[in-house]
């Protein structure tokens, strides 16, 4: 959560001089109370908006519009102070407009803008604008909240933008997954224009318990230029319990752009579809959740071994 | 006003190429993304493929093996070729501008876009496969 | 594939009539749709964008409302220039796809 370069914050428009203010998201109103306030903002919209930079860079912002109330109340308004809240971090950033001429009714309803807070695909922001000065303490609200979710770099127009490029959204691996006889699993997938390693993770379950029962990592050392945009194929051995059906298969790739935090693609192979009698699940079978094995993860390609140090992937 | 056309050969024979080329005046060709959408007789609206002015491409799964999408900035144009042609693939072919400049105030040094689908479409143009 | 689908597929209405049309998506896509007109042999024109934002030009007895799954667009008092065909378009994920239409002829 930031701010585009603050040189370029504007809120002027015709009929008002106005300048945009860092704020420390705590008004003076808040501390030295005025007996008459404004009343609340109307109509609070967030849309998802892109702003081109001049340095080519694309970033997705939150385009925060509202209008005024028509009442009198307009001519104690002395400006509005703008909050991003970040919910999963609770890192919150302000900005205060700061109306320098007395506002007037006219013919159209006033209407504010400002689009200059950027947001981080996936995630999920409070947006409030207060209207200044803030109410005396037991006074009616004047400020307007809403929600605002963000979309992940998979969503159509999300992907060329700058931090979604920077983990690799324009890579399509184009995962196939392959059974094989003997217990075995083949994962091809289209490897990218770079020179890096990748890691394909493998995590089997039953089909009923959402526990890990097996769980392989396989190493892909980097492609050479050649290699590029073609197919790579691993082969897992699969856990020898037949309940442990249901695999989960990632390929995290290790851009430059992104390193350990590259978008990560994902399939899913469901357990075969058996006959009306399901085979029961031999208890014992069942205690380790999954099977420890001796052995490192660094192996090439089509190399059946692998490690199974148990991870968490989210 | 931002205008689109369509260009092309109206004929194709089934196992060939079909050409079309898309020509973008009164506007920039910068910033957008552009569509191919097309629709067979009779039928509804199927959308093809798209390509970012930077030439960035989102495809049709359905049609992803015989599609590619190329744009020509200094021209100010876009094409769509798709291969392998069959009698299905008749259809009015229409180009489309995905994306508005955000206009109001307060941009800065910025320009502003959004992407809510195509707003800007040429008139079509059709295309029958048959030998 | 996000599935789009509409109802009804086509409708009967007189001018004045207040026509609803809805339209479905298989998975939520936040409010990532269009609703598009489209006469014969003409190329579709777009009324409504981001779910309930009315295109510049278009007359205010068009409305969309709706998010996530379930759109409406409402015209409040049909017009003789309104018998069309409207459709819906998620542009949310690729593929963008169309609702299959709603044919609005005269009663």
């Known amino acids: 959560l930031r701010l585009l370069d603050h040189r370029a914050l504007v809120c002027s428009q015709p009929g008002l001089n106005c300048t945009v203010k860092n704020s420390t998201c705590l008004d003076d109103s808040w501390i030295h109370p005025r007996n008459l306030t404004p009343s609340s903002p109307k109509d609070l919209q967030i849309q998802l908006h892109f702003a081109h930079t001049q340095q080519g860079d694309l970033f997705p912002v939150a385009h925060i519009e509202w209008t005024l109330q028509t009442d009198a109340s307009i001519l104690y308004l002395e400006g509005a102070e703008l909050s991003v809240l970040q919910l999963n971090t609770n890192e919150r950033l302000c900005v205060r407009f700061e109306f320098l001429s007395k506002l007037r009714h006219h013919h159209r309803r006033w209407r504010f803008t400002f689009s200059h807070f950027v947001v981080d695909p996936d995630q999920e922001y409070e947006v409030t604008v207060h209207h200044l000065p803030k109410p005396i303490p037991d006074g009616d609200p004047n400020h307007q909240s809403k929600n605002f979710l963000v979309p992940d770099c998979e969503h159509a127009r999300m992907k060329v933008t700058t931090p979604c490029m920077s983990s690799g959204s324009l890579w399509d691996p184009n995962i196939t997954v392959e059974t094989l006889e003997a217990h075995q699993l083949r994962v091809s997938f289209t490897l990218w224009n770079e020179s890096t390693p990748y890691q394909v993770l493998l995590e089997s379950f039953s089909d009923s318990e959402n526990h890990s029962c097996f769980d392989v990592v396989k190493q892909i050392f980097a492609p050479r230029q050649e290699e590029f945009h073609q197919r790579a194929n691993v082969t897992f051995t699969l856990s020898k319990f037949h309940w442990c059906c249901h695999h989960h298969v990632q390929v995290q790739p290790f851009f430059s752009s992104c390193l350990n935090d590259c978008l990560r693609h994902a399939v899913t192979v469901p357990c075969p579809v058996i006959s009306n009698t399901t085979v029961p699940k031999p208890v014992a079978d069942y205690i380790p959740l999954w099977e420890p094995r001796s052995g490192s993860s660094d192996y090439k390609d089509d190399d059946d071994k692998g490690s199974s140090h148990h991870h968490h992937h989210h | 006003q931002v205008q689109l056309q369509e260009s092309g050969p109206g004929l194709v024979k089934p196992s060939e190429t079909l050409s079309l080329t898309c020509t973008v005046s009164?506007?920039?060709?910068?910033?957008?993304?552009w569509n191919w959408i097309r629709q067979s007789p009779g039928k509804g609206l199927e959308w093809i493929g798209d390509?970012?002015?930077?030439?960035?491409?989102n495809y049709n799964p359905s049609l992803k093996s015989r599609v590619t999408i190329s744009v020509d900035t200094s021209k100010n144009q876009f094409s769509l070729k798709l291969s392998s042609v069959t009698t299905a693939d008749t259809a009015v072919y229409y180009c489309?501008?995905?994306?508005?400049?955000?206009?109001?105030?307060?941009?800065?040094?910025?320009?502003?876009?959004?992407?809510?689908?195509?707003?800007?479409w040429g008139q079509g143009t059709t295309v029958t496969v048959s030998s | 594939d996000i599935l789009m689908t509409q109802s009804p597929s086509s409708l009967s209405a007189s001018v004045g009539d207040r026509v609803t049309i809805t339209c479905r998506a298989s998975?939520?896509?936040?409010?990532?749709l269009g609703w598009y007109q489209q006469k014969p042999g003409k190329a579709p024109k777009r009324l409504i964008y981001?779910?309930?934002s009315l295109q510049s030009g278009v007359p205010s007895r068009f409305s969309g409302s709706g998010s996530g799954t379930e759109f409406t667009l409402t015209i409040s008092s049909l017009q003789p220039e309104d018998f069309a065909t409207y459709y819906c378009?998620?542009?949310?994920?690729?593929?963008?796809?169309f609702g299959p239409g709603t044919k609005v002829d005269i009663k």
């Open positions: 009164g506007g920039s060709i910068s910033n957008y993304y």
């Open positions: 981001a779910a309930s």
């Open positions: 998975q939520g896509i936040r409010n990532d």
């Open positions: 390509i970012y002015y930077s030439g960035s491409t």
């Open positions: 489309a501008r995905d994306g508005e400049l955000a206009n109001y105030y307060g941009s800065g040094s910025y320009q502003f876009y959004y992407y809510y689908g195509m707003d800007v």
């Open positions: 378009l998620q542009h949310n994920s690729n593929p963008f796809t």
